[in-house]
């Protein structure tokens, strides 16, 4: 009898259970009771990444300059090309399909996780005791100046923006 | 006991025609693909048709299509060759073979074609 | 077309000789190869499917292997009913093609 399911690594045509082809080649033409299906290599810059019955193969991903990708690792017959952005630069997406500039933390704002390829600098403000007077995608909230340690005292208070000022001590007369 | 009998052979003037038969018994034959294969005298083997379980589909490497046809009568458990514009490189023994697992499993004890003038 | 190529074309050996038969084919045909016997004045007979897949009531000492493009038939141990005609023949496209033969006789 002609079967109605086939087992994995094949598909149903005709009433007849035909192999898939393996990844990285494309079916040329279904198998017959005489013939194994036929199945043929992706050409250059090609790829399937399933055992398949695509009649064409995939076009790598292009990591396109122009849009601040570059080639992180080069694809294969049974691969894609992955793309990343350029330095300075991370993913709009998890396609990454173009790039945008890292975001920098206004002053009062610290890096709390510096941008990869693919996220963006996570900022976090500066909490009490903590400062940031730059825009910066690198820079993490200062702490403020211990006055004490140095033998001076405090003349103007911190913000999340600046730093103590300190003074010396007022002299007994 | 899958068997398998070939019959219609003989001699015959080039130019000309003859049809052979396969008389299947002791299997589904209506399951099965068929294949023709020939043995020129002293020679290897070469494939010359095959036609899918049902009767559908047909194949014929390219020195005898358009001269020869294959078909099958499931109801008579028969299948037939049907040779025409016949050439003497056409003298061979014909073997008919069940498709079994895509291999030639079982096959006739063949019926011989001679070709000549 | 696959053309398959079979070499030696002739092996001559003693029973119980181990024969190995080769079979190469012009292109890559994954597993796609069976292999036959063929005796004097007999129809062929099957003995592996599949390159490497045993046949229900053959002996033993027929073993196959390969993928691809090279093919191997062996016999480990040759006994006098071994000596015929062997072939390989390809389903990887149409059209079906043979090799031309190895002829395994006695020395």
């Known amino acids: 009898e002609p079967p109605t399911a086939c087992r994995e690594k094949q598909y149903l045509i005709n009433s007849q259970c035909c192999s898939l082809c393996q990844p990285g080649q494309k079916l040329v033409s279904d198998c017959t009771e005489f013939t194994e299906t036929e199945c043929l290599p992706c050409g250059e810059s090609e790829f399937l990444d399933t055992w398949n019955r695509e009649t064409h193969c995939h076009q790598h991903k292009y990591c396109d300059p122009n849009l601040g990708l570059r080639v992180q690792q080069k694809g294969t017959s049974e691969t894609d090309t992955i793309c990343t952005c350029e330095e300075g630069w991370h993913c709009t997406s998890e396609a990454c399909e173009s790039c945008v500039l890292h975001r920098s933390c206004s002053p009062g704002f610290g890096v709390k996780q510096i941008a990869t390829g693919v996220s963006d600098t996570i900022c976090e403000p500066c909490p009490v005791g903590f400062f940031s007077n730059v825009s910066s995608a690198f820079e993490k909230c200062h702490p403020w100046t211990s006055c004490e340690t140095k033998d001076l005292v405090v003349q103007q208070a911190g913000t999340n923006k600046t730093d103590v000022v300190c003074g010396p001590q007022d002299r007994l007369r | 006991e899958v068997q398998l009998v070939e019959s219609g052979g003989g001699l015959v003037k080039p130019g000309g025609s003859l049809r052979l038969s396969c008389a299947a018994s002791?299997?589904?034959?209506?399951?099965?693909?068929i294949s023709w294969v020939r043995q020129a005298p002293g020679k290897g083997l070469e494939w010359v048709s095959s036609?899918?379980?049902?009767?559908?589909?047909?194949y014929y490497p390219d020195n005898v299509k358009g001269r020869f046809t294959i078909s099958r009568d499931n109801a008579k458990n028969s299948l037939y060759l049907q040779m025409n514009s016949l050439r003497a490189e056409d003298t061979a023994v014909y073997y008919c073979?069940?498709?079994?697992?895509?291999?030639?499993?079982?096959w006739g004890q063949g019926t011989l074609v001679t070709v000549s003038s | 077309e696959i053309v398959l190529t079979q070499s030696p074309a002739t092996l001559s050996l003693s029973p119980g000789e181990r024969a190995t038969l080769s079979c190469r084919a012009s292109?890559?045909?994954?597993?796609?190869l069976h292999w036959y016997q063929q005796k004097p004045g007999q129809a062929p007979r099957l003995l592996i499917y599949?390159?490497?897949q045993s046949i229900s009531g053959i002996p033993a000492r027929f073993s196959g292997s390969g993928s691809g493009t090279d093919f191997t038939l062996t016999i480990s141990s040759l006994e006098p009913e071994d000596f015929a005609v062997y072939y390989c023949?390809?389903?990887?496209?149409?059209?079906?093609?043979f090799g031309g033969g190895t002829k395994v006789e006695i020395k």
């Open positions: 002791g299997f589904t034959f209506s399951n099965y693909g």
């Open positions: 073979a069940r498709a079994g697992e895509k291999a030639m499993d079982y």
């Open positions: 599949y390159a490497s």
């Open positions: 036609i899918s379980s049902g009767g559908d589909n047909t």
């Open positions: 292109q890559t045909i994954n597993n796609n």
């Open positions: 023949q390809q389903f990887s496209s149409w059209p079906l093609t």
